[in-house]
């Protein structure tokens, strides 16, 4: 009981990061900086704490990095817009969990998050947001990697 | 999965020409950098343009390429290079390639080549 | 615009050796660095990339290392066939670092 089910095609959510990638990622000018690849925190996570560090970063990409970013191209804001509705959908998902009191958050996994968005915070705000989509993948292969996903029809 | 240049040959100082990148085993509908890469003789290698064959089209260009260089793509298998005012320092080999830059690095693809000569 | 660096210009070893070659970048890049070996009439061909992680079918003879500014390729246990030249470039994904991303090259001849 403690991994809630994400009930959200996690394969389309890939697709879409695919194809809008390399244009968010070649605006990206800080090699140095990282906000969440290679990031050790979300490597050694405990099983117990998959839930809330999920709804955690879901919360990170909806409320900043979405919202910090300004795209204009519309090709590329109609998939992020994709992503976006579906990250609402999944923290939807989560709410169900919390309900059933199974998305505790311990401090390990709070100070996971605090680092997160401390590492948003060093770079100027559009800087941030390109950085942080450009490393959704590492979001992305986490879920895979820490919840049972179950494919919706 | 291969690419194969086009388009190469002896053209005379000042003359334009465009080069054809080709794909085969793959194709450009999806999202790829497909970029041109250029070596003098006996010298090397030049970054010259990239394209993303994606959604978003984005083009990027050396800045001593701006202005004389296009690259586009122009069917889901053809990305082109057209040049123009071109001078003997043109001479070159080009190379098209997939994904240099990025991290799908690992699976990046280069075409054999073809050579521009620039001459009167 | 980031400038890459590669020294020496050219380097001698004999078969069964060790060759070193140094790429340095004008500002930190991260791990973001490849090499490549190039043949007369060939495109180049990725030996390593993210500075040390060895591409598809490439020997561990070659061995890359280093991050920031500073990149070393090592090819040990020389063969006939390692005789090219090799480049250094920064593959970082943002695309303000693409201009003059490779070395100049360096020649290796096996003797």
């Known amino acids: 009981l403690r991994r809630c089910l994400i009930s959200t095609d996690m394969h389309h959510i890939e697709e879409s990061f695919q194809e809008i990638k390399r244009a968010i990622q070649a605006k990206d000018t800080f090699p140095n900086v990282t906000i969440l690849s290679t990031l050790e925190t979300l490597q050694i996570i405990k099983p117990l704490d998959v839930c809330c560090v999920t709804k955690n970063l879901l919360a990170f990409y909806v409320d900043r990095v979405f919202k910090d970013h300004q795209e204009p191209n519309p090709k590329i804001l109609r998939k992020i817009s994709s992503i976006a509705n579906s990250f609402l959908y999944m923290q939807k998902t989560l709410r169900q969990c919390q309900e059933q009191r199974q998305c505790h958050c311990r401090q390990e996994a709070t100070n996971a998050t605090r680092v997160i968005h401390d590492n948003y915070d060093q770079l100027e705000v559009h800087a941030a947001a390109i950085k942080s989509l450009g490393e959704l993948d590492v979001f992305l292969a986490w879920i895979n990697k820490n919840h049972e996903v179950m494919f919706s029809a | 999965q291969q690419l194969e240049e086009s388009g190469g040959g002896l053209v005379q100082p000042e003359g334009s020409l465009t080069l054809t990148c080709t794909a085969s085993g793959f194709s450009f509908s999806s999202s790829y950098w497909i970029c041109w890469v250029r070596q003098a003789p006996g010298k090397g290698l030049e970054w010259l343009a990239c394209?993303?064959?994606?959604?978003?089209?984005?083009t990027y260009y050396a800045n001593w390429a701006k202005g004389r260089f296009t690259i586009s793509k122009t069917s889901s298998t053809t990305v082109t290079l057209q040049m123009t005012s071109l001078t003997a320092a043109d001479t070159a080999t080009y190379f098209c390639?997939?994904?240099?830059?990025?991290?799908?690095?690992?699976?990046?693809?280069w075409g054999p080549g073809t050579l521009v000569t620039v001459s009167s | 615009d980031v400038v890459m660096t590669q020294t020496p210009a050219s380097v001698e070893a004999a078969v069964g050796g060790t060759v070193t070659i140094k790429c340095q970048a004008s500002?930190?890049?991260?791990?973001?660095l490849a090499w490549y070996q190039q043949k007369p009439g060939q495109p180049p061909k990725l030996l390593i990339y993210d500075a040390s992680k060895l591409a598809s079918g490439v020997p561990s003879r070659f061995k890359g290392s280093g991050s920031g500014t500073q990149f070393t390729l090592t090819i040990s246990d020389l063969e006939c066939a390692d005789a090219a030249t090799y480049y250094c470039q920064c593959h970082y994904h943002g695309s303000s670092y693409w201009d003059n991303s490779f070395g100049g090259g360096t020649e290796v001849v096996v003797k």
């Open positions: 500002e930190s890049i991260g791990n973001a």
């Open positions: 394209i993303d064959t994606g959604v978003s089209g984005d």
């Open positions: 390639a997939r994904d240099i830059f990025g991290s799908a690095i690992d699976n990046s693809l």
